[in-house]
Amino acid sequence: RRRRRDTHFPICIFCCGCCHRSKCGMCCKT
């Protein structure tokens, strides 16, 4: 479970076709 103070930070994960991109790479989303 994320700490409360982390709530509004983006979380970054590896994924494919994410973050408006066609390939695989890191993607950070709030």
Partner: antibody, heavy 121, light 107 residues
């Protein structure tokens, strides 16, 4: 100017611990993911760990998982690497590197000068 | 386990085009980056997202990535380009791979 300065390296015996620091300046430290990358003498680059914006969002290479801990103190603009149970194969120059800005930070866009860690009895 | 493979060395004459390859399983499905490391210095990012150049990197550096191979091309190679070059790509959140490096010699 944008700068990363590592410190804390040295000679340490196998099984002992060491903590590396990386002081950042010239940019908003809290707005960037930060990595540790190492390079054994005469060898290539090996990624070690990353800490993203949230303290809970961190990842490690299999070779160091369970032994190394990455952390950051945004109030001090400093990145850390706590290295426990050190082995001879951990001997390397350790670089801190900034992750690229933006929602898709695949690259390491700024590197420090590195600090040498030698594990030897 | 995945790995990225580069030729250990590449030689080129001044003013000619140097081509450095990086091969890996399904590498073209992920974004590749390239770093230059001069002797005794820290790495410098020269290409990201396959073909994009950071500010301050000369136009003679270009990149491409498809299939299983990413390519770094240096046009009009200069003596100052002599260095080690490393490719890099993400294969998972806990697996960032670097190639073994290619030593570029400008004859």
């Amino acid at each position: 100017q944008v700068q990363l300065v590592e410190s804390g390296g040295g000679v340490v015996q196998p099984g002992r611990s060491l903590r590396l620091s990386c002081a950042a300046s010239g940019f908003t430290f809290s707005s960037y993911g930060m990595h540790w990358v190492r390079q054994a003498p005469g060898k290539g680059l090996e990624w070690v760990a990353v800490i993203w914006y949230a303290e809970s969002n961190k990842y490690y290479a299999d070779s160091v998982k369970g032994r190394f801990t990455i952390s950051r103190d945004n109030s001090k603009n400093t990145l850390y690497l706590q290295m426990n149970s050190l082995r001879a194969e951990d001997t390397a120059v350790y670089y801190c590197a900034r992750a690229q800005e933006g929602i898709a930070p695949d690259a390491f866009d700024i590197w420090g000068q590195g600090t040498m860690v030698t594990v030897s009895s | 386990s995945y790995e990225l493979t580069q030729p250990p060395s590449v030689s080129v004459s001044p003013g000619q085009t140097a081509t450095i390859t990086c091969s890996g399983d399904k590498l073209g499905e992920r974004y590749a980056c390239w770093y230059q490391q001069r002797p005794g210095q820290s790495p410098v990012l020269v290409i990201y997202q396959d073909s994009k150049r950071p500010s301050g990197i000369p136009e003679r550096f270009s990149g491409s990535n498809s299939g299983n191979t990413a390519t770094l091309t240096i046009s009009g190679t200069q003596a100052m380009d002599e260095a080690d070059y490393f490719c890099q790509a993400w294969y998972s959140s806990t697996n960032v791979l670097f190639g073994g490096g290619t030593k570029l010699t400008v004859l």
